[in-house]
Interface confidence: low
Amino acid sequence: QLLEPCGYIYPEFPVVQRGSNFTAICVLKEACLQHYYVNASYIVWKTNHAAVPREQVTVINRTTSSVTFTDVVLPSVQLTCNILSFGQIEQNVYGVTMLSGFPPDKPTNLTCIVNEGKNMLCQWDPGRETYLETNYTLKSEWATEKFPDCQSKHGTSCMVSYMPTYYVNIEVWVEAENALGKVSSESINFDPVDKVKPTPPYNLSVTNSEELSSILKLSWVSSGLGGLLDLKSDIQYRTKDASTWIQVPLEDTMSPRTSFTVQDLKPFTEYVFRIRSIKDSGKGYWSDWSEEASGTTYEDRPSRPPSFWYKTNPSHGQEYRSVRLIWKALPLSEANGKILDYEVILTQSKSVSQTYTVTGTELTVNLTNDRYVASLAARNKVGKSAAAVLTIPSPHVTAAYSVVNLKAFPKDNLLWVEWTPPPKPVSKYILEWCVLSENAPCVEDWQQEDATVNRTHLRGRLLESKCYQITVTPVFATGPGGSESLKAYLKQAAPARGPTVRTKKVGKNEAVLAWDQIPVDDQNGFIRNYSISYRTSVGKEMVVHVDSSHTEYTLSSLSSDTLYMVRMAAYTDEGGKDGPEFTFTTPKFAQGEIE
């Protein structure tokens, strides 16, 4: 038994560039040749335990055999040299691991960052995968001094072990080395102070101003290497519920500062702020954002009066009428603060005024049959809105001028209303609407539109398949004009039920059918037409179509003494629904006719 290897493979640690050719040789020792009665022609090459084809093998002399591989692509191959001892027993001589890969690419895009309070971190693009163990070393030096090398763990970045020195230029480059080659990146030369990423500003606080409801004052603490750097800021803000940030123009925050007043804000609105900083030259990196801080602008007087309307209740006597003044709460964007109350002033023609302070959104008063002027203002702690003014004419005055060409139509899940204005200048329009039902009263909602508007959508929460009665009233300086109404659906559906048909009169060869209109609660849309289907027990079905304005129809050319089955369907724009089936029998003889 030989204790020493019987021979060796050269090279012993083969590393091959992918796609290239590679030759290995196996040299047998003389002692081995004699011991096993072999020579190099007895050598069998194997890769990963599989025999290499003979055509890749060359016997060089009695001790040496070579094997050649072309276009090497496998990352790792176990290559063994074996002999057939005594001509038949395979004996392992030597084995090596053959690795394949690529020499390192020249690293590119080398950049460095100095996170404030930490050492410098440099990153680069190593290029293509080498498939080999590759060492990346970050080298750095001054003109006169070398710094310790930085050995990269991941091959794409390295944090140096020394603290950066500012205001002195440093040269930095990356060396990449593996078994197939060594390469250096282009070097970069910079002053570390131009690569600083400051820590985020902190202690950000927000205060409002009683004098100006459109501003908020910010103050914060900046680090900037403990005051070594002058920093400029980037300020962003948003309303509390918004998702998108608004940018304060960078040119407004160019100079180093630790406070700033943000202008053009909405009154009584909560804003969220964040801030970050960078070296004032713009070199280096933006800090991360500070923690967010919020503040609310001061209140301002309401920016407009509420929408204002009135309804007259049926009068009990002849001298007085009950008038319900109604108005809408202002949206937050117009209230500019918490509305404390509303001031209503009622003035009778050329007479004394009566002032009411109301916390709700309606006021019912008994008025004589004279003309009145009502004004309404909303009040918060800063002041009152402008007044909305309504003229309430005497009940004896007939309203003139109404809108024309009133139309309503659904679009984009909204119910739109449009009209042509009357020929006289309008102060505003009032739109009122309610669900028509035979089971419940028409509970009205309303909205006000400016004089310039002649197309709008109803802003309430509307339901599908419900019939809405919509009324539009122009309002003039002298009082309301005439009202125009129409019916509309946000979305139609097929009727909930079909008509119930009956016979009004049955003759030998004809029958008059009658039906009631489907109740509005079951219509689910505009009934466009009806269909009447009728048949005998043996005959084919006949269908007639009837306009929706009819409530009766005469079937003619019927057979005498015959049982007929009849059914009706009603159709909206969205489909139809059958009513119950009804049967009738025609008489054998006409009236007065004898067999």
Epitope: N109, T111, I113, L121, Q123, W124, D125, T156, S157, K197, D234, Q236, S243, T244, W245, I246, Q247, R276, I278, G282, K283, G284, Y285, W286, S287, D288
Partner: nanobody
Framework: QVQLQESGGGSVQAGGSLRVSCVIS????????MGWFRQVPGKEREGVAA????????IYANSVKGRFTISQDSSKNTVYLEMNGLKLEDTGMYYC??????????????????WGQGTQVTVSS
Amino acid sequence: QVQLQESGGGSVQAGGSLRVSCVISGFTYRQTFMGWFRQVPGKEREGVAAISTGGGSTIYANSVKGRFTISQDSSKNTVYLEMNGLKLEDTGMYYCAASTVITSVSINRGLYQYWGQGTQVTVSS
């Protein structure tokens, strides 16, 4: 909060084309650097291309130069990667990333703070 949403990935034959998109929301788009990165299982995420949304300057990895184009539509807060002449090795999960810290365009992934969920691109022969 900041959100990046990629779309447009899919399967394509070698030599074909594909366009992936990334919509950015939650911060001021014009202040940003946007990058496309890709990753195959078991390998590190690698930079493909990047763009400065303010100035429009671009950078590309050597492996995609001349085949891929990065562009933006600032009105839609969207960055695109147009990929032509696709090769088998372009297969991978493509990620969109945003950086608000850098001051020059870069495809070093460590400089990007915000990442999308990724969209798969598969190139077959």
